[in-house]
């Protein structure tokens, strides 16, 4: 029997055992976070599946994810939101230590989907494990990209107080207008709820003592934020290793000097 024709995309296919992974992560999350104990993970999976199954994977909309977003509604206390751009690992290491601050991946929906890929096919109920659309080579309205755009928008919209963002000082564009932070989150911070955005620019080189807060792209970020009536602050984190160590042990004598 000849296999049925299947669309070939440029990106890697759905992560193996995707349904099982999402369900297992959901259960683990709801067990660890008492405020989410009411969440029915089977319903979460059904809503997740409903967002992309049997839909053309280049025509996914934010509307498709609304049932899932509704089930995963969660609030972050004011002053406790940490956004990041191109420096995910350090941001996550930080919130693992500073347990009262939260990245999107510390929230249920972000946690469910972190590092996973998924897509379906139009008019079939199959999950495509062979290939999925690539954002650049195929289309931007693919299931994974639209998911992150949707939940990132919601995460930014619900932030309040002083919002922090971790930026990668090793990149040519420390602030990139085309990143999720630059294209979605920055524009969805609510001025009536957010007093300030504080950027932490993470230095890569050990001997790098330049003030990266003066970088043109940071000035561009400051301009965008200021125009939105949100105050802007910037800090250099010269020694990310020391920075994490001092978050763990703030009493350490070496933490009294600059990081």
């Amino acid at each position: 029997v000849l296999p049925r024709w299947r669309q070939q995309w440029s990106g890697s296919g759905t992560t193996s055992r995707f349904p099982e992974t999402v369900l297992a992560r959901c259960v683990k999350y709801t067990e660890v976070h008492p405020e989410m104990r009411h969440v029915d993970c089977q319903s979460v999976w059904d809503a997740f599946k409903g967002a992309f199954i049997s839909k053309y994977p280049c025509n996914i909309t934010e509307e498709d994810y609304q049932p899932l977003v509704k089930l995963g509604t969660q609030t972050v206390p004011c002053n406790k939101t940490l956004l990041w751009s191109r420096i995910k690992d350090l941001a996550h290491q930080f919130t693992q230590v500073q347990r009262d601050m939260f990245t999107l991946e510390d929230m249920l929906l972000g946690y469910l989907a972190d590092d996973l890929t998924w897509c379906g096919e139009f008019n079939t109920f199959e999950i495509n494990y062979q290939s999925c659309p690539d954002w650049r080579k195929d289309c931007s309205n693919n299931p994974v990209s639209v998911f992150w755009k949707t939940v990132s928008r919601r995460f930014a919209e619900t932030a309040c107080g002083v919002v922090h963002v971790m930026l990668n000082g090793s990149r040519s564009k420390i602030f990139d207008k085309n990143s999720t932070f630059g294209s979605v989150e920055v524009h969805n911070l609510q001025p009536e709820k957010v007093q300030a955005l504080e950027a932490w620019v993470i230095h890569g080189g050990r001997e790098d003592s330049r003030d990266l807060c003066q970088d043109p792209t940071i000035k561009e970020l400051e301009s965008i934020i200021s125009k939105r009536n949100i105050r802007f602050f910037c800090k250099n984190i010269y020694r990310p290793d020391k920075f994490l160590q001092c978050v763990k042990n703030p009493e350490d004598s070496s933490c009294l000097s600059g990081i």
């Epitope: 055992r17 995707f18 029915d40 089977q42 319903s43 199954i53 079939t124 199959e126 999950i127």
Partner: antibody
Framework: EVQLLESGGGLVQPGGSLRLSCAAS????????MSWVRQAPGKGLEWVSA????????YYADSVKGRFTISRDNSKNTLYLQMSSLRAEDTAVYYC?????????????WGQGTTVTVSS | QSVLTQPPSASGTPGQRVTISCSGS?????????VSWYQQLPGTAPRLLIY???QRPSGVPDRFSGSKSGTSASLAISGLQSEDEADYYC???????????FGGGTKLTVL
């Protein structure tokens, strides 16, 4: 010991209603999805309905959609199947089953069944 | 007409190995959904034999084994015994129907 005990079966006229119950014991009831499966005399197994562990999602076979309602009371460790507009073809032994974990993992514990007869 | 297709009957002599097939489609077995197998002895409730394609619950002899390939699954019983005479059903989730589906059942006779 993990146990499921069905009750509520009996003889009912076509168009009538019946409510089946399934009392669960020996496991954390609110950690597992539950299902109803039936078997008409001399026939094979037919899945009827399922409900997720917190009751947020329900699923039905096309043959019972709109007529049967599955529900659960986690405080009482009890599963229910409300059957209305009953037809002769609904005559069967109805089994309550515990899902192995999720609704697509299968059912690892079954009750002994309760008989429903629809006849005038 | 069942969504999953099983042979209505199978037979073997004691000690023999028999295999029961279960054929599905891309919306159920072929869509990363697990297959489970059930044994129903005459006059009793079904019992889980195999779950997650090839896993045996505790208490099920290792003479029973399950496998899956593409849109089909099979149950193998080696060292057939007279007490294995029963009806066997395969089952899985169907994403098109959003429902659990069973095969029509296979009546195994030990000759």
């Amino acid at each position: 010991e993990v146990q499921l005990l069905e009750s509520g079966g009996g003889l009912v006229q076509p168009g009538g209603s019946l409510r089946l119950s399934c009392a669960a014991s020996g496991f954390l009831f609110d950690d597992y999805g539950m299902s109803w499966v039936r078997q008409a005399p001399g026939k094979g197994l037919e899945w009827v309905s399922a409900i997720s562990y917190k009751g947020g999602s329900t699923y039905y076979a096309d043959s019972v959609k709109g007529r049967f309602t599955i529900s659960r009371d986690n405080s009482k460790n009890t599963l229910y199947l409300q059957m209305s507009s009953l037809r002769a073809e609904d005559t069967a032994v109805y089994y309550c089953a515990k899902d192995h974990k999720w609704n697509y993992y299968g059912m690892d514990v079954w009750g002994q069944g309760t008989t429903v007869t629809v006849s005038s | 007409q069942s969504v999953l297709t099983q042979p209505p009957s199978a037979s073997g002599t004691p000690g023999q190995r028999v295999t029961i097939s279960c054929s599905g489609s891309t919306s159920n077995i072929g869509n990363d959904n697990y297959v489970s197998w059930y044994q129903q002895l005459p006059g009793t409730a079904p019992r889980l034999l195999i779950y997650k394609d090839d896993q045996r619950p505790s208490g099920v002899p290792d003479r029973f084994s399950g496998s899956k390939s593409g849109t089909s699954a099979s149950l193998a019983i080696s060292g057939l015994q007279s007490e294995d005479e029963a009806d066997y059903y395969c089952g899985t989730w169907d994403d098109r129907l959003n429902a659990w589906v069973f095969g029509g059942g296979t009546k195994l006779t030990v000759l």
